[in-house]
């Protein structure tokens, strides 16, 4: 079977005026997933994205990462987009530095 | 095959508001946002706003933002545009659209025409 | 506000002849965020070209884009009668999402 993926925002100061953007997905089966940034709903260009390998997270499922680099004030237009094994979520960038809430998608 | 199927054609009065719905099909409809974009008649192509359907998050044309409202009913897969206090000026075309891989508007509703007449 | 500036307003061609359409931008514009898009009368628009260069699905090979910063460029090597439309460029780099006032291509 498929073990849907936690998947986790979040955000650090980049540059004067820029905020680099990071999209989480963990504990996932099998290891075949779409994670991508989008803004206002359309895939940012490969070249302004930064993937991390899949890799096994050591529990039989896997883990990866896409980050950004975003104008800060922009957030808004912003979101993560995650499918796996036939389902999709839709991550926002949290707000300020508050803690991240990790959401497991079915 | 990817439609979005509008809701018919409306006349109003000045002073009153209109919803116009937006159903798509062929894909799943929280996956990809619905905006929204009117055209008056003769006239260019005008951006109101769009809708992420999975978060609800909406982000609107400042110029819109008091008197357009957009929702989405998910259990019927469903977009909506509201308009109020309707002007003469708000007769146009209105169209759903949805957001594609590469580009803003991907496919294309058929348009919805209000007339704003007294 | 980014305004985008269409030229020619019409453009008045033969079939067979070469159509080179200008949209101009008020502020620079990442080639990846600028979209074309054709509209024949009655109908919706329709997406024609994406990020300046690409042919969206179905699009004939006529039709090429080009261009950076803030000058683009929409070109159809050979008009045939199915052409003579309305076309729109768009940009998505900067809200509000914004489009050109279109050129009509008509038939001479």
């Known amino acids: 079977g498929s073990v849907p993926p936690m998947v986790n925002v979040t955000r650090s100061e980049a540059s004067e005026g820029n905020i680099t953007v990071t999209c989480r997905a963990s504990s996932f089966y099998p290891r075949n997933i779409t994670l991508t940034w989008r803004q206002d709903g359309v895939s940012l260009s490969h070249d302004t994205q930064q993937w991390g390998d899949v890799l096994p997270d050591g529990n039989g499922t896997y883990q990866t990462w896409v980050a950004t680099r975003i104008c800060q004030g922009e957030e808004q237009r912003f979101t993560c987009y995650m499918e796996h094994s036939g389902n999709h979520s839709t991550h926002p960038v949290p707000s300020g530095n508050s803690h991240h809430h990790h959401h497991h998608h079915h | 095959e990817i439609q979005l199927v509008q809701s018919g054609a409306e006349v109003k009065k000045p002073g009153a508001s209109v919803k116009v719905s937006c159903k798509p099909s062929?894909?799943?409809?929280?996956?990809?946002?619905i905006y929204w974009v009117r055209q008056a008649p003769g006239q260019g192509l005008e951006w109101i706003g769009y809708?992420?359907?999975?978060?609800?998050?909406?982000i609107y044309n400042q110029q819109f933002k008091d008197r357009a409202t957009l929702t989405v009913d998910k259990s019927t897969s469903t977009a909506y545009l509201e308009l109020s206090s309707l002007r003469s000026e708000d007769t146009a075309v209105y169209y759903c659209?949805?957001?594609?891989?590469?580009?803003?508007?991907?496919?294309w509703g058929q348009g919805t025409l209000v007339t704003v007449s007294s | 506000e980014i305004v985008l500036t269409q030229s020619p307003a019409t453009l008045s061609l033969s079939p067979g002849e070469r159509a080179t359409l200008s949209c101009s931008a008020s502020?620079?514009?990442?080639?990846?965020?600028l979209h074309w898009y054709q509209q024949k009368p009655g109908q919706s628009p329709r997406l024609l070209i994406y990020?300046?260069?690409n042919l969206a699905s179905g699009v004939p090979a006529r039709f090429s884009g080009s261009g950076s910063g803030t000058d683009y460029t929409l070109t159809i090597s050979s008009l045939e009668p199915e052409d003579f439309a309305v076309y729109y460029c768009?940009?998505?780099?900067?809200?509000?999402?914004?489009f050109g006032q279109g050129t009509k291509v008509e038939i001479k």
């Open positions: 659209s949805r957001s594609g891989e590469r580009s803003n508007f991907d496919y």
């Open positions: 062929g894909y799943a409809f929280t996956s990809n946002n």
């Open positions: 809708i992420d359907p999975y978060i609800g998050r909406i």
């Open positions: 502020s620079s514009i990442s080639s990846n965020y």
């Open positions: 990020r300046t260069s």
């Open positions: 768009q940009q998505g780099g900067s809200l509000p999402l914004t």
